[in-house]
């Protein structure tokens, strides 16, 4: 399970319509539900029962948004609609060129993505927890444009981002 | 079908205010970024600003603190407003779905916006 | 901001012949984490909205006939037809949606 180096992006917008880039950086895990790839992209934050309509709006997902799914405790969801690993593919499946999930109220679902799979996902499926989870979360709460990169080797610049 | 419809257009005076609306239909509009863009009369697409899933906005140096873009997720509706309007924001204002950094599949038919005295 | 310079401004070509536009960036639209060029064309015939033709830069948008094709990386980019056919008399545009969105200036397509 190699370490994932996401830099999360914040466009922070002043009263002036003008605004700056903010960049945070904290660590994840590859799981081996998905392929160890860089992937970036703009960051949607998805419900899990949000990842359980099965319908025709699938194919209408524009292509390169990274999901952030907050995961919550198996109590509260005994019996889901799809597994953690079905999650991952139906966010894949709609367009997510990464998929992050946030474990701290579900740490087995860590076994569940790295269970072997014969067919991985061709996308990064990442987790995380903690503090990184915790930070992660802050940012994805927040009115504000963010944006991900992840990486499967430290990153080199701090700041490797659009002028803006 | 993914469905966006502009409405509120019409002639206003130089210096008023206007709020455009897109209504979206047929897709999970809270589950994306939308764009407001506009074109002049015999001339090109020029992208106005962004507002994101969860309500962040980035605007175009033009038009920054002027121009507002916000959104309802339970009314599926986009909303542009334009304050002190000027002449120079007479145009055809198109509302389209996408994140900051994608493209544009699915665009409204338009809503014309005329500043004349 | 991005800048895109499109070329030609405008042309007149008869049905069944072949055109090319260009757009060059003021930087790469290359992205580095995904290795996607965000460039795409547009199409606008007279009274309508812009249609997606194509999106970064060389993937075709379903149902759009394959006489359009879309080509080049980094900063310099090709919208060619083949075939051209009196229906495709509009407008044609790039975007680069690398940055804060950009479009290029446009190019008149008309049919002799």
């Known amino acids: 399970k190699e370490t994932a180096f996401v830099e999360v992006v914040l466009f922070e917008s002043s009263p002036s319509g003008d605004y700056t880039t903010y960049t945070t950086g904290l660590t994840g895990r590859f799981s081996r539900a998905g392929a160890t790839l860089s992937a970036e992209g703009e960051i949607v934050q998805m419900h899990p029962l949000g990842l359980c309509n099965n319908n025709d709006e699938e194919d209408l997902y524009e292509y390169g948004w990274v999901g952030v799914v907050k995961l919550e405790q198996p109590e509260l969801d005994p019996k889901p609609c799809l597994t953690v690993l079905g999650k991952a593919k139906r966010a894949v499946q709609r367009g997510a060129t990464a998929v992050i999930f946030d474990v701290s109220e579900n740490p087995e679902a860590i076994d569940q993505l790295n269970q072997g799979s014969e067919d991985p996902l061709k996308r990064p499926v990442v987790y995380v927890k903690g503090a990184d989870a915790i930070k992660l979360m802050n940012i994805v709460n927040k009115q504000k444009v963010a944006r991900a990169r992840i990486q499967h080797r430290p990153p080199r610049q701090p700041t490797e981002y659009f002028d803006m | 079908e993914v469905q966006l419809v502009e409405s509120g257009g019409g002639l206003v005076p130089p210096g008023k205010s206007l709020k455009l609306s897109c209504s979206a239909s047929g897709f999970p509009f809270s589950n994306y970024g939308m764009h407001w863009i506009r074109q002049a009369p015999g001339k090109g697409l020029d992208w106005v600003g962004y507002?994101?899933?969860?309500?962040?906005?980035i605007y175009a140096d033009a038009v920054k603190g002027r121009f507002t873009i916000s959104r309802d997720n339970a009314k599926n509706t986009l909303y542009l407003l334009i304050n002190s309007l000027k002449s120079e924001d007479t145009a055809m204002y198109y509302c389209a779905r996408g994140y900051f950094d994608g493209y544009y599949r699915f665009w409204g038919q338009g809503v014309m916006v005329t500043v004349s005295s | 901001d991005i800048v895109m310079t499109q070329s030609p401004f405008s042309l007149a070509v008869s049905e069944g012949d072949m055109v090319t536009i260009m757009c060059r960036s003021s930087q790469s639209l290359l992205s580095s984490g995904n290795q996607k060029n965000y460039l795409a064309w547009y199409q606008q015939k007279p009274g309508q909205s812009p249609k997606l033709l194509i999106y970064?830069?060389?993937t075709r948008q379903s149902g759009v006939p394959d006489r359009f094709i879309g080509s080049g990386s980094g900063t310099d980019f090709t919208l060619t037809i083949s075939d051209v056919q009196a229906e495709d008399l509009a407008d044609y545009y790039c975007l680069q949606h690398y940055s804060s969105p950009t479009f290029g200036s446009g190019t008149k397509l008309e049919i002799k």
């Open positions: 970064h830069a060389s």
């Open positions: 507002i994101s899933s969860n309500s962040g906005t």
